[in-house]
């Protein structure tokens, strides 16, 4: 039961995380105009990965897409790439994990196959989360650098008397969404990897023998000899007897061919 719960929870957490990564990638507020210690403007500027927007005091909002590809900063391109890789890996991970869920039965899929799929999706979620966190962090670092650069020359003189105010940008909501979402995807991936360990079939050090004494239909299964689960373990090497000492996760709804000798 614990393994199923861990797997299910890992899937749900990753699903929320990936939805968050997608939302963050699409959001326009990656960087927002810094309002602190700045002249009060009648406009509010904010920028995303794909377009920049201006909200006027009337509420009128105008957005312009970045229609150039080569003219964009390399860092922005890198952030875009990291976020897209994160989304793609996460989406594939979700697809794989759906089939890996213990509560879903697909044909006669072996537990070891589900364990492998769970591990694969878990790794994909971890990498997806790391990509998102890296992407958001790179963008945040870019903002911090630009912020202090623009603070150093906040007012750049133009022809002596005339001044132009440089717009400073600070962290937008999308950065926080991205960090949280990346973290959730990462946690979900770790949970899937943990669940994978419990999903793989157990291998005991020796074959248990069933003795049918009169009045007893349950054989004693020695404990404490759990072999370390190999993710690519030989599925033909099955337990001869599976009676009595099952964990809740191992209970099957129909009799196994190994239930009786």
């Amino acid at each position: 039961m614990a393994v199923t719960a861990c797997q299910g929870l890992g899937f749900v957490v990753s699903l929320i995380g990936i939805a968050g990564i997608i939302a963050a990638t699409c959001m326009d507020q990656w960087s927002t105009q810094d309002l602190y210690n700045n002249p009060v403007t009648a406009v509010f500027n904010y920028q995303g990965l794909w377009r920049s927007c201006v909200r006027e005091s009337s509420g009128f909002t105008e957005c312009r897409g970045y229609f150039t590809l080569l003219g964009l900063p390399a860092m922005l391109q890198a952030v875009r790439a990291l976020m897209i890789v994160g989304i793609v890996l996460g989406a594939i991970g979700l697809l794989v994990s759906i089939f890996a869920l213990k509560c879903i039965r697909i044909g006669s899929m072996e537990d070891s196959a589900k364990a492998n799929m769970t591990l694969t999706s878990g790794i994909m979620f971890i990498v997806s989360g790391l990509c998102a966190i890296a992407g958001v962090s790179v963008f945040a670092n870019m903002l911090v650098t630009n912020f202090w650069m623009s603070t150093a020359n906040m007012y750049t003189g133009m022809g002596g008397m005339v001044q132009t105010v440089q717009t400073r940008y600070t962290f937008g909501a999308a950065l926080f969404v991205g960090w949280v979402a990346g973290g959730l995807t990462l946690i979900g991936g770790v949970m899937m990897c943990i669940a994978c360990r419990g999903l793989a079939p157990e291998e005991t050090n020796y074959k248990a023998v069933s003795y049918h004494a009169s009045g007893h239909s349950v054989a004693y299964k020695p404990g404490g000899f759990k072999a370390s689960t190999g993710f690519g373990s030989n599925t033909k090497n099955k337990k001869i007897y599976d009676g009595g000492a099952r964990t809740e996760d191992e209970v099957q709804s129909y009799p196994s061919k190994h239930d009786y000798v």
Partner: antibody, heavy 120, light 113 residues
């Protein structure tokens, strides 16, 4: 037809108070920010205050900050400017003007104005 | 505060001739976010409230004749009346629409020569 009608002007002594009103019609009042602008006799235009659609943002000119209070009642399509501690330099024609929606913050419609005279 | 300086203070132009009014701001009115200029021009006839002519430095407001045009960017702006008509006699004001407090120029009085 968009209409803005100011009222409440008059003669007041220095240090006195006055409340100006602006009645709006012909448009959805709650969708627009409104400005107060004044013009002293023979002088140029001077922006006084601005209130956003939902009253969440109110800005004042430094010359009136702490003395004037701007408010609005969207249910009554009305705008108010409460003026206290009035000075001789506040003597002017006061206009309420609508902040245009897509006019780069410019004021697209103006009322006819109401005259405020501060004199002893 | 942004200081708006108009020149000349008054201008006399013959009917049918071109009239040009200049406006300079102490800071750039070009918003970096959308590369748009936040400057408006108003026309005020005697005894009347101002009327919006131009916004965004160059866009004519609805109902404004096409003889009125606005140009310029950053700190230097111009209002041009290509062919002066009798009804254009008025005071013209430029206004900073980017920074609070919103500020106006001192006004330019346009008369017929």
């Amino acid at each position: 037809e968009v209409q803005l009608v100011e009222s409440g002007g008059g003669l007041v002594q220095p240090g006195g108070s006055l409340r100006l009103s602006c009645a709006a019609s012909g448009f959805t009042f709650s969708d627009y920010g409104i400005h107060w602008v004044r013009q002293a006799p023979g002088k140029g235009l001077e922006w006084v205050a601005y209130i956003s659609r939902g009253s969440s943002t109110i800005y004042y000119a430094d010359t009136v900050k702490g003395r004037f209070t701007m408010s609005r009642d969207n249910a009554k399509n009305s705008l108010y400017l409460q003026m206290t501690s009035l000075r001789a330099e506040d003597t002017a024609v006061y206009y309420c003007a609508r902040g245009g929606y897509d006019t780069r913050n410019a004021m697209d419609y103006w009322g006819q104005g109401t005259t405020v005279t501060v004199s002893s | 505060d942004i200081v708006m300086t108009q020149s000349p203070d008054s201008l006399a132009v013959s009917l049918g001739e071109r009239a040009t009014i200049s406006c300079k701001s102490s800071q750039s009115l070009l918003n970096s976010g959308n590369q748009k200029n936040y400057l408006a021009w108003y026309q005020q006839k005697p005894g009347q409230p101002p009327k919006l002519l131009i916004y965004g430095a160059s866009t004519r407001a609805s109902g404004v004749p096409d003889r009125f045009s606005g140009s310029g960017s950053g700190t230097d702006f111009t209002l041009t009346i290509s062919s002066l008509q009798a009804e254009d006699v008025a005071i013209y004001h430029c206004q900073n629409d980017l920074y609070y407090p919103l500020t106006f120029g001192q006004g330019t009085k346009l008369e017929i020569k």
